[in-house]
Amino acid sequence: ARNGDHCPLGPGRCCRLHTVRASLEDLGWADWVLSPREVQVTMCIGACPSQFRAANMHAQIKTSLHRLKPDTVPAPCCVPASYNPMVLIQKTDTGVSLQTYDDLLAKDCHCI
Amino acid sequence: ARNGDHCPLGPGRCCRLHTVRASLEDLGWADWVLSPREVQVTMCIGACPSQFRAANMHAQIKTSLHRLKPDTVPAPCCVPASYNPMVLIQKTDTGVSLQTYDDLLAKDCHCI
C-alpha cells in the first residue's frame, strides 16, 4: 500500500515520474546506438517528505532517523519502483540489431 | 557486475552500509514493540559519484544527465540493493508475538 500520495511541498514537487529529453551525445551513446536519435528518459525526481510514497519499513525508519540525526542519516530518496523496457537500434559488426533494455526507463517511483 | 567500487572522495565517503543505533522511542515503536529495546539499523549512506556502484543502466544515465542538467536531474542515490530479515517481539491483545520483517535492515547498497 502506498503511503501518503499528497505532496505537502506543492503539486509536482514530490517524488514522481518525470520525462527528461536526452540526445545520444548527452548519454555518450552516439558511437553504438543508431536510433532513436534522442531518448525520452523517464526518471524519478522530487522530494521525499515524511512518509510520502514510503517504499517499505526501512523508508519509514529512515524518515524517523533523518529527523533525529539529519547530519548522519539522509532523507529517503526518490527512486524507481519498477521499469519499462526500452528498445534501441544498435550498431553491430555485421550491421544493426534491435535490443531491448529492461532497466532503463523508470515506470513507477517510491521513496526509500 | 558492480561498476566502480573505488571511492574517489576518500575511504568510507561513498555509498556503503552503515549501522545507526536507534531506540524504540526514536523510531516511534515504544507502544507496540517489546524487544529489542534498541535497534541496530543497517542503512545505506554515502555519496554516489560517477558510476560508483551503479545499480543498472538507469543509474548510469542518471549520472550523465545530472552532469548536464544538475538543476533538474539529481545525482544517483545510495539505497539498499537487498535486505536482511529482523525479528521483533511485539505486543498483541493476547500477549506477545514474534514477528519477522523482511524489509527493515539493509544488507547491501548500490547507487540508483
Epitope: G12, R13, R16, T19, R21, S23, S35, P36, P85, L105 | -
Partner: antibody, heavy 113, light 110 residues
Framework: SVKESGGRLVTPGTPLTLTCKAS????????MSWVRQAPGKGLEWIGT??????GTWYASWVKGRFTISKTSTTVDLKMTSLTTEDTATYFC??????????WGPGTLVTVSS | DIVLTQTAASVSEPVGGTVTIKCQAS??????LAWYQQKPGQPPKLLIY???DLASGVPSRFKGSGYGTEFTLTISGVQCGDAATYYC????????????FGGGTEVVVK
Amino acid sequence: SVKESGGRLVTPGTPLTLTCKASGFSLSTYWMSWVRQAPGKGLEWIGTIYAGSGGTWYASWVKGRFTISKTSTTVDLKMTSLTTEDTATYFCVRGPNYSDAIWGPGTLVTVSS
Amino acid sequence: DIVLTQTAASVSEPVGGTVTIKCQASEYIYSSLAWYQQKPGQPPKLLIYDASDLASGVPSRFKGSGYGTEFTLTISGVQCGDAATYYCQCTDLSSSAGNTFGGGTEVVVK
C-alpha cells in the same frame, strides 16, 4: 515523416480507427502522440504511446473512449462512442519531447447525424 | 492532468516590436515545456523545446525562458510572418502531468 489516414464522416456512436504511418524512422524506438483540433479551437492532447514497450498515457478526458495501439509499422487511434464534440482534425506526432518533433498534415473526422 | 494557462488570448504588436507570451503550469514541471507556432490550415511548428532550447531552423528572434511553473516566449523584432497562434505544451509524461497544451495566444502584427 508521418501521415494520418482514416478520417471521414461518421454518425454519432460509430467507432472509427485512425492510422499513422511513419517513414524515414523506426517507430519501435520513438514516442508517438495523437493530438486533435476542433474547427477554430485550440490543440488538445489525446495520448501518447511508447512504441518500444507499448506503454500508453492518456489525457484524463479520454476516459477509455480512445485507445492508442501499435503495429510494427503504424500507430493506431481507435475511437468509440463518438459524439459531435469529437469533430476535429486529428494529428499524429513524433513526440512529445523531441527537438525535431514531426507532425503529420492531419486527418479530418466529422461526426454528424 | 496538469493545466497550462496562457493568460492572453490575443496580443497585437507593430512590426519590429517585442511580443511576450506567458504560460503558467498548475504544477512544477522543471523545464518540460515546448512552444509551437500554428498558422491557419497548417500543423503546428515546434519553436522551443526544454523551455529554452531553440528548435532547428527557428530564427533567434524567438526566445523561451522559465522553469518550474512560469514560462515565457519572447519574439523580438516581430515580423508580419510571425502572425500566428502560439501554444505552450507540457512535454512531461507522467501519470500526474500529461502532454497538455495551453489555450493558445493569437499574435496580430500591425
